[in-house]
């Protein structure tokens, strides 16, 4: 039986979760983030094969997001535009995961510090992403049944020299459904 991923100690070391990232903001947008076959990223009202995502910890508090169906990594340009890439560029495709008190998560580009915003449905990946919702509710997907794609970066150990070696300090200490088994 797999160890549930609710422990903050499992936030690093290659921990893998399958999730749908759902968002509902004040502008009547309700959508699941999906990474499409052509590399575009958008929102779908319903859960779909393209919206099932694999979230894998790279180091404390930092994850990569992989579209399970399309085998594309979620990445972000310096202007905030999202795209799905076949190649994992750690500087474009690594996101800091911040847990909020209400169960939602916020994701920020580790390199640029920009929050992950869901682009409009018709926004091509090469256009700057319009401002969309930045809070995502990670909904459990199916447990990983297929062997995971080869890791690009070896998981890094906790930064023992840091005052926050496990990246525990964030907007809150609240437990997110992202870590529900």
């Amino acid at each position: 039986h797999p160890i549930p991923d609710s422990s903050p100690l499992l936030q690093f070391g290659g921990q893998v979760r399958q999730r749908y990232l759902y968002t509902d903001d004040a502008q009547q947008t309700e959508a699941h983030l999906e990474i499409r076959e052509d590399g575009t990223v958008g929102g779908a009202a319903d859960q779909s094969p393209e919206s099932l995502l694999q979230l894998k910890a790279l180091k404390p508090g930092v994850i990569q997001i992989l579209g399970v169906k399309t085998s594309r990594f979620l990445c972000q340009r310096p202007d905030g535009a999202l795209y799905g890439s076949l190649h994992f560029d750690p500087e474009a495709c690594s996101f800091r995961e911040l847990l909020l008190e209400d169960g939602y998560n916020v994701y920020q580009s580790e390199a640029h510090g920009l929050p992950l915003h869901l682009p409009g449905n018709k926004s091509p990946h090469r256009d700057p992403a319009p401002r969309g919702p930045a809070r995502f509710l990670p909904l459990p997907g199916l447990p990983p049944a297929l062997p995971e794609p080869p890791g690009i970066l070896a998981p890094q150990p906790p930064d023992v020299g840091s005052s926050d070696p496990l990246s525990m300090v964030g907007p809150s200490q609240g437990r997110s459904p992202s870590y529900a088994s």
Partner: antibody, heavy 119, light 110 residues
Framework: EVKLVESGGDLVKPGGSLKLSCAAS????????MSWVRQTPDKRLEWVAT????????YYPDSVKGRFTISRDNAKNTLYLQMSSLRSEDTAMYYC????????????WGTGTTVTVSS | QIVLTQSPAIMSAPLGERVTMTCTAS???????LHWYQQKPGSSPKVWIY???NLASGVPTRFSGSGSGTSYSLTISSMEAEDAATYYC???????????FGGGTKLEIK
Amino acid sequence: EVKLVESGGDLVKPGGSLKLSCAASGFTFSSYGMSWVRQTPDKRLEWVATISTGGGYTYYPDSVKGRFTISRDNAKNTLYLQMSSLRSEDTAMYYCARHDLVDWYFDVWGTGTTVTVSS
Amino acid sequence: QIVLTQSPAIMSAPLGERVTMTCTASSSVSSSYLHWYQQKPGSSPKVWIYRTTNLASGVPTRFSGSGSGTSYSLTISSMEAEDAATYYCHQYHRSPPTWTFGGGTKLEIK
């Protein structure tokens, strides 16, 4: 217009060093992975080096690992290739190439610069 | 490391003829990772077909690409003079990241 222009190619003796530059224009340089690809005199294409968008991650084939170093200056929109311990088999036309954002094939190529290694 | 072998190395075809060239991988390659480039003498390579079947911008519709696993091909439905060039297949491997080219097929007019 999206453009890549290489420079720095020269005739150099075996064991020597050379630094190539590639000036990029017409696109947001810092958004793209970049590579060097060379074409040998027999017209074969060989991937030489790749660098991530921010420059922190680099990749090389075994044939140049430890001898070549790829780097970039996003503020100057310039890509570099430092070559050392050059061998005769490094003689080639060197192209700077941009990676497509989503599929990572080489979607834009420069005009190339010639490196000849000979005594 | 995957090796890409292109055949034939050189071929000639009369104008109007259907042309097919192949690219064989030493082990299976995802169709998303297989691309083709065209190069004419004195010019840099240009992406011609990406992800096995998708024509790059400006590529005539007489070109097509197909394949899966270890066998891929580029086809010209009706050879035209401007198609005379060398075509290279190219593969991306995800982990560790590497990029490999085939030896090329030189297409001439008969």
